[in-house]
């Protein structure tokens, strides 16, 4: 029951996280700044991964995609890549985890298969969350670095003077959405990995082994080849071994009262 709850909760948390990563990637408010200010009007700017928008105090708003821009920062492309990889991995993880859920029965899928799928989706969620956190952090670092580098300087350009303007900038809402969403996806992935341990079958069955008594009417119990079941008298998992022990594949089975499989 606890395993099902952990798995289910991990799935829900990851689902919310991935939805958040998608939302953050699409949002325009990755960074915000005041571009222009005078006593009558103010021009406020907010930028996303795909476009930049200006909003004036008069209500006028205009957004423009970056495809018109030649010199996009390489870091921006890296952030885009990280966020997209995060979304893709998260989406695949969600798809895998749906089939892995203990509460959903699909044919005669064994618990071991579900455990493997749960682990796979968990790892995918962890990587997805890390990608999102890394992407958002790289963007935040790029913002801080760029603004420190471009503090009010004036130089002569073609046709006159060029002056970099000191503006107040802030981290946009998308950064915080991305950090939280990445964290949730990461937590969800960890929960899925924890659930996987509980889903794994308790006993590991190895190849069945035939034992042949060497001359004496002594029965050898194969308890040692079942892990922690307490099967037979061999409860301490000590191998009961006999020189005549051979795997089922090797032995030519002749009917005998001493054969135990």
């Amino acid at each position: 029951m606890a395993v099902t709850a952990c798995q289910g909760l991990g799935f829900v948390v990851s689902l919310i996280g991935i939805a958040g990563i998608i939302a953050a990637t699409c949002m325009d408010q990755w960074s915000t700044q005041d571009l222009y200010n005078n006593p009558v009007t103010a021009v406020f700017n907010y930028q996303g991964l795909w476009r930049s928008c200006v909003r004036e105090s008069s209500g006028f708003t205009e957004c423009r995609g970056y495809f018109t821009l030649l010199g996009l920062p390489a870091m921006l492309q890296a952030v885009r890549a990280l966020m997209i990889v995060g979304i893709v991995l998260g989406a695949i993880g969600l798809l895998v985890s749906i089939f892995a859920l203990k509460c959903i029965r699909i044919g005669s899928m064994e618990d071991s298969a579900k455990a493997n799928m749960t682990l796979t989706s968990g790892i995918m969620f962890i990587v997805s969350g890390l990608c999102a956190i890394a992407g958002v952090s790289v963007f935040a670092n790029m913002l801080v670095t760029n603004f420190w580098m471009s503090t009010a300087n004036m130089y002569t350009g073609m046709g006159g003077m060029v002056q970099t303007v000191q503006t107040r900038y802030t981290f946009g809402a998308a950064l915080f959405v991305g950090w939280v969403a990445g964290g949730l996806t990461l937590i969800g992935g960890v929960m899925m990995c924890i659930a996987c341990r509980g889903l794994a079958p308790e006993e590991t069955n190895y190849k069945a082994v035939s034992y042949h008594a060497s001359g004496h009417s002594v029965a050898y119990k194969p308890g040692g080849f079942k892990a922690s079941t307490g099967f037979g008298s061999n409860t301490k998992n000590k191998k009961i071994y006999d020189g005549g022990a051979r795997t089922e594949d090797e032995v030519q089975s002749y009917p005998s009262k001493h054969d135990y499989v």
Partner: nanobody, 120 residues
Framework: EVQLVESGGGLVQPGGSLRLSCAAS????????MGWYRQAPGKGRELVAT???????YYADSMKGRSTISRDNAKNTVYLQMNSLKPEDTAVYYC??????????????WGQGTLVTVSS
């Protein structure tokens, strides 16, 4: 890089009119605001009028009611119509363009200036 070409300056009699124009060209992302500043001999640079991309205008008290700023977004051009000119309006008029630079602070570009002389 943005190139600014100013035109329309010259000698005008008091009470006369003049229309200044400034065209921006080059490669840039987006012009946020355009405006005109002036610098009289021996004085500092002062704002005359500005206009934002959305069309919001702002005028200095000295030019209120006597000037009209307008812009053509498609041509990236700003115009300043000045009427009832006075001798104290004599100055070098500079075109100013504020350009948005994605993920960085915006840049202000200044023209070379055009001289307006109000004299009889």
């Amino acid at each position: 890089e943005v190139q600014l070409v100013e035109s329309g300056g010259g000698l005008v009699q008091p009470g006369g009119s003049l229309r200044l124009s400034c065209a921006a060209s080059g490669s840039f992302f987006r012009i946020v605001a355009m405006g005109w500043y002036r610098q009289a001999p021996g004085k500092g640079r002062e704002l005359v009028a500005t206009i934002t991309r959305g069309g919001s205008t702002y005028y200095a008290d000295s030019m209120k009611g006597r000037s009209t700023i307008s812009r053509d977004n498609a041509k990236n051009t700003v115009y300043l119509q000045m009427n009832s000119l006075k001798p104290e309006d004599t100055a070098v008029y500079y075109c100013n363009v504020r350009v948005e630079v994605p993920f960085m602070a915006p840049n202000d570009y200044w023209g070379q200036g055009t001289l307006v002389t109000v004299s009889s």
